[in-house]
């Protein structure tokens, strides 16, 4: 891993900061913060190289991949706020996360070495979280079928398709980060 | 929505205080808190935050290491203990309450704080 | 640190002309900041959280955008009322700064 140095948001364009922030006071958010940033990169890069840079709705639809999403009933919200629910249930969805980015390291076509960053350090987010749950048997494993049917739809022939489901991943990913730092902040 | 600070006053340089903030009208044990000044025709700094739970804490460079940010949740009230204060110091203190996105929803009426000899 | 710089630092409006307010930082932050009014002798009041959304009770003719390190508050149709004091923040990385401050004048 590369050593510690600047946080993400300390430079002029955090996306591009390339140490882990690991001597921070609070390491699950200055990691989440690492992690963002990365993503942020990879999302620009999609859409300078490959012109893949609105959100596509229907083709989020169609993919079937069932993404995690953070809802009312997993306790992360201000409203019905209960914080080993959330922390169980924002584990579960990186866990489920990580095998989707598994797959996308391996069928990435640009900076394979942000996309590992991304994949590696939640990873390591997983693993603090993970101390942090007091029951880890509610950590559930996911479904390797979703696993399939994503390999299937990044090695298809069909580059926009591809790349959408790419850029969908990554988004999803960045939408479930930004509300588990709101999360994580609040406790 | 009700936040009520008090404890303001003047203090000397070196010196110290604690400021309160009492909250009313929702579910303090809910929300996050911050404290925010202004010192005399300047603008707005933000000093400290902390989460429902004080498992979250985090101070402005400026004040970190003199003030202390914490919180009663049985008695719905916010504190800011200061020491080691300078002229720097002088200002209107506000508490705020902080919604999701950590955005200041709810603010108290201020209590001012002169750091002088 | 990140730094958050806000333009103009004061203007002067008419009611019923439309204004933006700009609030530049030093790096990305990701959606995460608020504009705030104050008026003289009060308390700040949240407008606009989350780079976009418009806070509970707040007219429609405020409006925020912007996205990375680019963010700005729209008022159209100013109104008397609206004139005093706005300030932009953010709450990426520690601190959580605010901006300069524009003051908003009558002409």
């Known amino acids: 891993f590369p050593t510690p140095g600047p946080l993400a948001g300390d430079s002029k364009d955090d996306a591009t900061s390339n140490s882990l922030p690991l001597t921070s006071a609070n390491k699950v958010e200055e990691l989440i913060k690492y992690i963002l940033g990365k993503i942020s990169a990879l999302r620009k890069e999609m859409c300078d190289k490959f012109n893949k840079c609105e959100d596509s709705k229907e083709a989020l639809a169609e993919n079937n991949l069932h993404l995690p999403k953070l809802e009312g009933k997993d306790g992360c919200f201000q409203s019905g706020f209960n914080q080993e629910t959330c922390l169980t249930r924002i584990t579960t969805g990186l866990v489920e996360f990580q095998l989707h980015l598994n797959i996308l390291q391996n069928n990435y076509e640009g900076d394979k070495e942000n996309v590992k960053s991304v994949h590696m350090s939640t990873k390591i987010l997983v693993q603090m979280l993970k101390s942090k749950v007091k029951n880890q048997d509610e950590v559930t494993t996911p479904d390797p079928t979703t696993d399939a049917s994503l390999q299937a739809i990044l090695q298809s022939q069909d580059e926009c398709v591809k790349h959408t489901t790419i850029h969908l991943i990554l988004r999803s990913l960045e939408d479930f980060l930004q509300f588990s730092l709101r999360a994580v902040r609040i406790m | 929505v009700k936040l009520q600070e008090s404890g303001g006053g003047l203090v000397q340089p070196g010196g110290s205080r604690k400021l309160s903030c009492a909250a009313s009208g929702f579910t303090f044990s809910r929300f996050g808190m911050h404290w925010v000044r202004q010192a005399p025709e300047k603008g707005l700094e933000w000093v400290a935050y902390?989460?429902?739970?004080?498992?979250?804490?985090y101070y402005a460079d400026t004040v970190k290491g003199r003030f202390t940010i914490s919180r009663d949740n049985p008695k719905n009230t916010l504190f800011l203990q200061m020491t080691s204060l300078r002229s720097e110091d002088t200002a209107m203190y506000y508490c705020?309450?902080?919604?999701?996105?950590?955005?200041?929803?709810?603010w108290g009426q201020g209590t001012s704080v002169t750091v002088s000899s | 640190d990140i730094q958050l710089t806000q333009s103009p630092a004061s203007l002067s409006a008419s009611v019923g002309e439309t204004v933006t307010i700009t609030c530049r930082a030093s790096?990305?932050?990701?959606?995460?900041l608020a504009w705030y009014q104050q008026k003289q002798g009060k308390s700040p009041q949240l407008l606009v959280y989350n780079a976009e959304t418009l806070a509970d009770g707040v007219p429609s003719r405020f409006s925020g955008s912007g996205s990375g390190t680019q963010y700005s508050l729209k008022i159209n149709s100013l109104q008397p009322e609206d004139f005093g004091s706005y300030y932009c923040?953010?709450?990426?990385?520690?601190?959580?700064?605010f901006g300069g401050g524009t003051k908003l004048e009558i002409k």
């Open positions: 705020a309450r902080s919604n999701w996105d950590g955005a200041m929803d709810y």
């Open positions: 790096g990305n932050i990701h959606n995460f």
């Open positions: 902390i989460g429902r739970g004080s498992s979250t804490i």
């Open positions: 923040q953010h709450f990426w990385s520690t601190p959580w700064t």
